[in-house]
């Protein structure tokens, strides 16, 4: 039998990730929920212990007994100022046991206290189990990553956590080192290279500068902000929408924990959407006092909300460069790590800072550290594979896949051109009171209505207990394997009752010619489908332009180049438009376009005057005439409770 593989684990502050190198490539392993990263959360209830997604999903219901951020405690003394500061923000209790911090929770009716190593070991156990479920055999050998700034005590405590989890820790390696390995930067054969790793995760921000020479890694400098990450961006969105709800409905939801939790979930998903789309919709049914909250946000507005946070990421970059005694021109490679580096504005700020230098971002930033750890684990296990760095070229889904929802609407779970294999899950509900079953009708195609798309198959999920409309939760999962075989499963979350259908390439699927025809048809009928999209697009263009102009004239670099009168003129008009937008989200396309042209009439003469002869277009990457039109609306964010 082949030798058991060793795994690489990125033990993160908010999320963890596990990978394995086998058959000449790295596989990042999805958990039982289909997610390739797992929350570093452990929850204790009256009946059970939950780890990962299950723990995070119930955090609002059980905050005192849901533990996260163990990485902020591990290897530290109770009296450490970091521990004392962080404790103020945690809903769970941290107690002092001989100057060692312990987390105190209620578990199965008893008070229990756990060391941070124990909590981390539970997360590591989960990651080990995820790998074992995938590989089909027990796993013991692992490489675990830690931040470059971790001291010996923190490293040893992390290793201990691995041992508690039943792992043989082959090595503790630095997260930035792992990311550099993932990109093969240790094997370029170009002599000494200076690599800057920019790691913006869920809760922390780390900048590291490494020197790599002949396979030897040396950490030259580290900097960062231990409390900056994706969660901060989520908070800005939550605050923004709380204010919007106040404006629209004259009600304050901020004290209602369930409403805020549901809003935060939608905000996190909207944020992710905004990395690939210029607009995201939020649809939360009965958010507060029976009020449905349907709204949207543009990328430009999100960037404005977080502008100070995004800009602040450059300070640690400058500090790391100073500490490493390097000029930015001496950095050979820039590596992006952490989910928040998907944010286009963050990438642009970094790229602009380094004068347009290319960023290493081809590996999923959530997974780069685990990827490198998996490569390192394979090397330490003696894998002599030549193609340790080869990447698998993934196939894609040629058409969107989805199901029919109320009114014959096509709700896509897997978007056209998604790489496969892939798995997507979404919660649906009933349309009528006491509805006994749901008909799951699976379609492929790009049209807004299912009648215009191709029916792949249908099945019924019956036996739903009587309940008012909107109460039952039907979890639908679309899972395409590497061979393009689609499994659709529907599960009633209250009873656990499930039904499924398997759709293979040869059964009801479209040929290449039919796919081509459907894509062309979708183009032909775009006008019908896009009346709404055009409206949103016009809104989008206006909002983006307003925020871009506001940001342009507020740019410190323009001090002295623009008169105060002109600056005021632009800012006043931007404020007028932004406020108008807030109050008129449902205005017509013509109104949005009129406002944009009005704003352009004020801004363009002023802005173009600044950039004429400056060897390039104006701010935001468009010329003096500003952006025309705007891209279509982003994917809708469905409610997830």
């Amino acid at each position: 039998m082949a030798k058991a593989a060793a795994i690489g684990i990125d033990l993160g502050t908010t999320y963890s990730c596990v990978g394995v190198f086998q058959h000449g490539k790295v596989e990042i392993i999805a958990n039982d929920q289909g997610n390739r990263t797992t929350p570093s959360y452990v929850a204790f209830t009256d009946t059970e212990r939950l780890i990962g997604d299950a723990a995070k999903n119930q955090v609002a219901l059980n905050p005192q007994n849901t533990v996260f951020d163990a990485k902020r405690l591990i290897g530290r003394k109770f009296g450490d100022p970091v521990v004392q500061s962080d404790m103020k923000h945690w809903p769970f209790q941290v107690i002092n046991d001989g100057d060692k911090p312990k987390v105190q929770v209620s578990y199965k009716g008893e008070t229990k206290a756990f060391y941070p190593e124990e909590i981390s070991s539970m997360v590591l156990t989960k990651m080990k189990e995820i790998a074992e479920a995938y590989l089909g055999y027990p796993v013991t050998n692992a490489v675990i990553t830690v931040p470059a700034y971790f001291n010996d005590s923190q490293r040893q405590a992390t290793k201990d956590a691995g041992v508690i989890a039943g792992l043989n820790v082959l090595r503790i390696i630095n997260e930035p080192t792992a990311a550099a390995i993932a990109y093969g930067l240790d094997r370029t054969g170009k002599g000494e290279r200076n690599v800057l790793i920019f790691d913006l995760g869920g809760g922390t921000f780390d900048v590291s500068i490494l020197t790599i020479d002949d396979g030897i890694f040396e950490v030259k400098a580290t900097a960062g902000d231990t409390h900056l990450g994706g969660e901060d961006f989520d908070n800005r969105l939550v605050n923004h929408f709380v204010e919007e709800f106040k404006r629209k409905h004259k009600k304050d939801i901020s004290q209602n924990k369930r409403a805020v939790r549901r809003l935060r979930t939608a905000c996190e998903r909207a944020k992710r959407t905004l990395s690939s789309s210029t607009q995201a919709s939020l649809e939360i049914d009965s958010l507060f006092e029976g009020i449905d909250f349907y709204t949207s946000i543009t990328r430009a507005r999100f960037e404005e909300l977080c502008s100070d946070l995004f800009r602040s990421t450059l300070e640690p970059v400058e500090k790391a460069l100073r500490d490493a005694k390097l000029d930015k021109a001496q950095i050979h490679d820039l590596v992006l790590v952490g989910g928040s580096t998907r944010i286009p504005k963050v990438q642009k700020l970094l790229q602009d800072f380094f004068n347009g230098r290319d960023l290493n971002k081809s590996i999923n930033p959530d997974e780069a550290v685990a990827y490198g750890a998996a490569v390192q684990a394979a090397i330490l296990m003696g894998d002599k594979s030549e193609n340790v760095q080869d990447l698998l070229l993934l196939d894609v889904a040629p058409l969107s896949l989805g199901l029919e929802t109320a009114g014959g609407v096509m709700t896509a779970l897997i978007k056209r051109n998604s790489t496969i294999p892939t798995k997507q899950t979404q919660i649906f509900t009933t349309y009528s009171d006491n509805q006994p079953g749901v008909l799951i009708q699976v379609y492929e195609g790009e049209r807004a209505m299912t009648k215009d798309n191709n029916l792949l198959g249908r099945f019924e999920l019956s036996g739903i207990p009587p309940a008012p409309r909107g109460v039952p939760q039907i979890e639908v999962t679309f899972d395409i394997d590497a061979n393009g075989i689609l499994n659709v499963t529907a599960t009633d979350k209250s009873t656990g009752k499930a039904n499924k259908i398997t759709i293979t390439n040869d059964k009801g699927r479209l040929s290449k010619e039919e796919i081509e025809r459907m894509v062309q048809e979708a183009e032909k009928y775009k006008a019908e489908d896009e009346v709404q999209r055009e409206r949103v697009s016009a809104k989008n263009a206006l909002e983006s332009y307003a925020f871009n102009m506001k940001s342009a004239v507020e740019d410190e670099g323009l001090k002295g180049k623009i008169s105060e009168a002109d600056k005021k003129k632009v800012l006043d008009k931007c404020q007028e438009v932004i406020s108008w937008l807030d109050a008129n989200t449902l205005a017509e396309k013509d109104e949005f376009e009129h406002k944009r042209k009005e704003l352009e009439q004020v801004c363009n003469p002023i802005i173009s005057g600044l950039y004429q002869g400056a060897g390039g277009p104006g701010p935001g990457g468009f010329g003096a005439q500003g952006p025309k039109g705007g891209s279509g609306s982003g994917p809708t964010i469905e409610e997830v409770d």
């Epitope: 007028e576 406020s579 108008w580 042209k597 009005e598 352009e600 009439q601 003469p605």
Partner: antibody
Framework: QIQLVQSGAEVKKPGASVKVSCKAS????????MNWVRQAPGQGLEWMGW????????TYTDDFKGRFTFTTDTSTSTAYMELRSLRSDDTAVYFC?????????WGQGTLVTVSS | EIVLTQSPDSLAVSLGERATINCKSS????????????LAWYQQKAGQSPKLLIY???TRESGVPDRFSGSGSGTDFTLTIDSLQAEDVAVYYC????????FGGGTKVEIK
């Protein structure tokens, strides 16, 4: 001083076209939008739309889409309003008006009479 | 589309007396961010082009006599001519610029 000077009165037959000009002076033409307003005999003011003089992008109200075209010539600081397929109910005075916080400067108006 | 309804249609006032013209909007013209109402008033004398009197509800255009004043917020607005002069005989129009632009139907002011 700021002035908007419009072309003279026109008498046209139904089905014909007319092009009214509005020459601006005393300010930077491309810094302000130019609006067009119609006033039928004995009637009130009716906003037709406007043109962004910097980008050349026009905006037409629903009632004035199709037969009407707003254009500019920035080299001569002139805005134009062309009306095709004239009908008798197009008989009116057509005003151009500069827009700052409101329509602060107006042309003297051009009477277009459509009569067979 | 925002509709502006002016009242009365015509008004006869003695010289030196106060003239009051109302303008009602089908929706609020208040921008909560700028705290401005986007309503303007224009004067059109017989055979002449309209002339801007007031914008943003109450800001007088330069050169406009201070007997002209504007007030109101949201949907209800008023133009007041404090002491009517002979040269004030004209048709007065309100116009909104909150979203797109629309004019009211006009109010004719005459001397009684």
């Amino acid at each position: 001083q700021i002035q908007l000077v419009q072309s003279g009165a026109e008498v046209k037959k139904p089905g014909a076209s007319v092009k009214v000009s509005c020459k601006a002076s005393g300010y930077t033409f491309t810094n302000y939008g130019m609006n067009w307003v119609r006033q039928a005999p004995g009637q009130g003011l009716e906003w037709m739309g406007w043109i962004n003089t910097y980008t050349g992008e026009p905006t037409y109200t629903d009632d004035f889409k199709g037969r009407f075209t707003f254009t500019t010539d920035t080299s001569t600081s002139t805005a134009y309003m062309e009306l095709r397929s004239l009908r008798s109910d197009d008989t009116a005075v057509y005003f151009c008006a500069r827009y700052d916080h409101a329509m602060d400067y107006w042309g003297q108006g051009t009477l277009v009479t459509v009569s067979s | 589309e925002i509709v502006l309804t002016q009242s009365p249609d015509s008004l006869a006032v003695s010289l030196g007396e106060r003239a009051t013209i109302n303008c009602k909007s089908s929706q609020s013209l208040l921008n909560s961010g700028t705290r401005k109402n986007y309503l303007a008033w224009y004067q059109q004398k017989a055979g002449q082009s309209p002339k801007l009197l007031i914008y943003w509800t109450s800001t007088r255009e330069s050169g406009v006599p201070d007997r002209f004043s504007g007030s109101g917020s949201g949907t209800d607005f008023t133009l007041t001519i404090d002491s009517l002069q002979a040269e004030d005989v004209a048709v007065y129009y309100c116009k909104q610029s909150y979203t797109l632009y629309t004019f009211g139907g006009g109010t004719k002011v005459e001397i009684k």
